[in-house]
Structures are given as C-alpha cells and as structure tokens.
C-alpha cells in the first residue's frame, strides 16, 4: 500500500464544542432541504478499496472539493452557521496541505471522481446535499486523520 | 438489539455445497456490511468474504473461485454459497456487521456461529 | 497478506492480577488493530479497534497500545469472566487477518 506522510490532524481540532456543534447545526440544517434521500455521499462505497491507513488522504480530497466547489459557491445560504463553519474547514483543509501519498493513488482518485460526480449530476441539490453530510465529514476526518 | 444467527446443515458430503444463512435483526442490510469468517476447531479465525450494503461483494482470494455471497434485503438475510467442500472445510462459520460505514473492517457483532462438518 | 504473530498461545494468571497479550504484524498496518475476546457459547466480542480505542461496552480495565507492527492488549485487575480466548485483527486492508489466538486461563 502507499505509504502516506503528513497525513495527521491534532486531536483539539475536533474537541472544540461550540465549531462542532456549529457544523452539526450547519448539516442538520441543510439536510433538512436535501429531498434526495436515496443517494449518500460519504458511505461505505468512498472507501470501497482505501486501507485505513489511506483514508486520510482521501478525506482531505473530499475536504477541498468540498469547499472549493460546494461550501465558497454557496458561502451567501445557511447563515450564520456557514460564515463559521467555512473558515474552520479552511484551516483543517491547510494543515493537510502536507498531506501526500507516496505512490500510486490512483485508486483513491477514482472513489474521490465518482463522489465529484455525483455532486455535479445533482447540480444545486447534490451541493445541498454534500453540506447535509458535514456531520460525516467531520467525522470521518476525525477518524482518518487523528 | 443488533442480532445475527448463523443456521445451516452440521454435515455436508465433501465436494458437496455448503450453504449457511445469516438472518440479522436491530439493523439495516442496506446501511451495514456483513462479513463471513471460519474457524477451523481450535484454530484462528479466517475472515471470507463481506457483502456491502449496496450489495457489493468482497472475497478473501484464498476462496474467490469457489465462494458466493448473496442477499435477501427483504428477509434480512445474507447467503454464503462455497462449493467444492473438502474435509479442511469443517470449522465454524460465523457472520459479523461492520461497526459503522467508516469502521467498515471492524467486525462489531457476531452471530454465535454455525458448525459444518464435511464428512462423508 | 498480512501475517499477525500472537503471543504468547497460553496465559495462566489468577484473579486480580495483569497480564499483557502481544501481536505482531508482518507490515506496518498503522493503528488499526483489534482485539476480540472469544468464549465458548457465546458470540465473540469486540474489545477494542483502531490499536487502542475501546468499543462501547468494554470495561476500563482493558486497554491497547502500540502501533505500526507491535500492539499489545493488557488487562488489568483480571475478572473471573475476562479468562477466554484472545484474538487480534488488523483492519487496515483486504483481506483482514487475524492473530492465531491467546487462551487465558486460570491459575
């Protein structure tokens, strides 16, 4: 496998109750407006051949398409919670700057290419979506990269 | 209350088919996967197979030619289909749910096993 | 695939005492192993995951440390019902392996 380096976020980025509670009000907020609930971005399938120890890597993927072709577009709707939610996810998406894999990651890209998609085939509703599903990833950025 | 159980015939002749069934309870087919792993008496565990909740299939290569996992959404349960069976195949065949979609190859609940013995 | 290397195959220690369980993987698989605890007559059950993260339901006497190749499972202030078999898993990549078993028992 790959070997990944820099790919690690301090625990206290993801201890901070009141940015927490702000993503999930964000996600809640949005998944309330989501209507497409047959189709799940960050699921089983986004790892579907990632080893645990790739994972990382990949949700900091997912992490910068998010803000760059979900959460910067829409920055103006689910306010004030957007306005806090985005410059946090910046500073997470700029500590994994660092972030490499050593090798070929081409299987990463695929599962990362399909999510993109995904998204873009939704148009409008697959952005809602990908901000209804903050709360996962927050989480599977805790889990990958702690 | 997450729940699996394994049933399925104790003795199958040998080059025969053996063909357990997981049935589940507490849980979603369609939300976790579900893994198959043997237990040779007194002996480690082998992990098979897992069906994804898409219905996806994985197999361990060591069985890839001779194994099928299977599903039945609407009966929640899960089929393991392996033919050839030989007399290394007596064991204890268990199923097990992943933890969660990102802990997906952690194996949380077991079922409390099926024993086969292939004998003829 | 990955080898796990389990030792020791036996462990005989009383009530109250501590005793460590090691697992050795044949590559570096990160954080991401296992522990199970197997008894007869009953569905095995997760202790730990991610080398030393304890799954819900898992008494604080039980706790897991190490990383790349070398984990170890230590448990503290033995119980009566903690004598079983121990089994490690790494959960790093396919196909998951599992260590050949540590069989706790009673002095």
């Known amino acids: 496998a790959p070997i990944s380096s820099h790919c690690r976020l301090d625990k206290s980025n993801f201890q901070q109750p009141y940015i927490t509670n702000r993503t999930f009000m964000l996600a809640k907020e949005a998944s309330l407006a989501d209507n497409n609930t047959d189709v799940r971005l960050i699921g089983e399938k986004l790892f579907h051949g990632v080893s645990m120890s790739e994972r990382c890597y990949l949700m900091k993927q997912v992490l910068n398409f998010t803000l760059e072709e979900v959460l910067f577009p829409q920055s103006d709707r689910f306010q004030p919670y957007m306005q806090e939610v985005v410059p946090f996810l910046a500073r997470l998406s700029n500590r994994l700057s660092t972030c490499h894999i050593e090798g070929d990651d081409l299987h990463i890209q695929r599962n990362v290419q399909k999510l993109k998609d995904t998204v873009k085939k939704l148009g409008e509703s697959g952005e809602i979506k990908a901000i209804g599903e903050l709360d996962l990833l927050f989480m599977s950025l805790r889990n990958a990269c702690i | 209350e997450v729940q699996l159980q394994e049933s399925g015939p104790g003795l199958v002749q040998p080059s025969q088919t053996l063909s357990p069934t997981c049935t589940v309870s507490?849980?979603?087919?369609?939300?976790?996967?579900v893994h198959w792993v043997r237990q040779h008496s007194g002996k480690s565990l082998e992990w098979m197979g897992r069906?994804?909740?898409?219905?996806?299939?994985s197999y361990n290569s060591a069985f890839t030619s001779r194994l099928s996992i299977t599903r039945d959404t609407s009966k929640s349960q899960v089929f393991l289909k392996m033919n050839s069976l030989q007399t290394e195949d007596t064991g204890t065949y268990y199923c097990?749910?992943?933890?969660?979609?990102?802990?997906?190859?952690?194996?949380?609940?077991w079922g409390p096993g099926t024993t086969v013995t292939v004998s003829s | 695939d990955i080898v796990m290397t389990q030792t020791p195959s036996n462990l005989a220690a009383s009530p109250g005492e501590s005793v460590s369980i090691n697992c050795k993987a044949s590559?570096?698989?990160?954080?991401?192993l296992a522990w199970y605890q197997q008894k007869p007559g009953k569905a095995n059950k997760l202790l730990i995951y991610?080398?030393?993260t304890l799954q819900s339901g898992t008494p604080s006497r039980f706790s897991g440390s190490g990383s790349s190749t070398d984990f170890t499972l230590t448990i503290r202030n033995l119980e009566p019902e903690d004598f079983g078999l121990y089994y490690c898993?790494?959960?790093?990549?396919?196909?998951?392996?599992f260590g050949s078993g540590t069989k706790l028992e009673i002095k």
């Open positions: 590559k570096t698989i990160s954080k991401y």
């Open positions: 069906m994804w909740s898409d219905g996806d299939t």
């Open positions: 507490g849980f979603s087919l369609t939300s976790y996967s």
């Open positions: 097990a749910r992943s933890l969660d979609f990102y802990y997906d190859t952690t194996l949380a609940f």
């Open positions: 991610s080398g030393s």
């Open positions: 898993q790494q959960h790093n990549e396919y196909p998951l392996t």
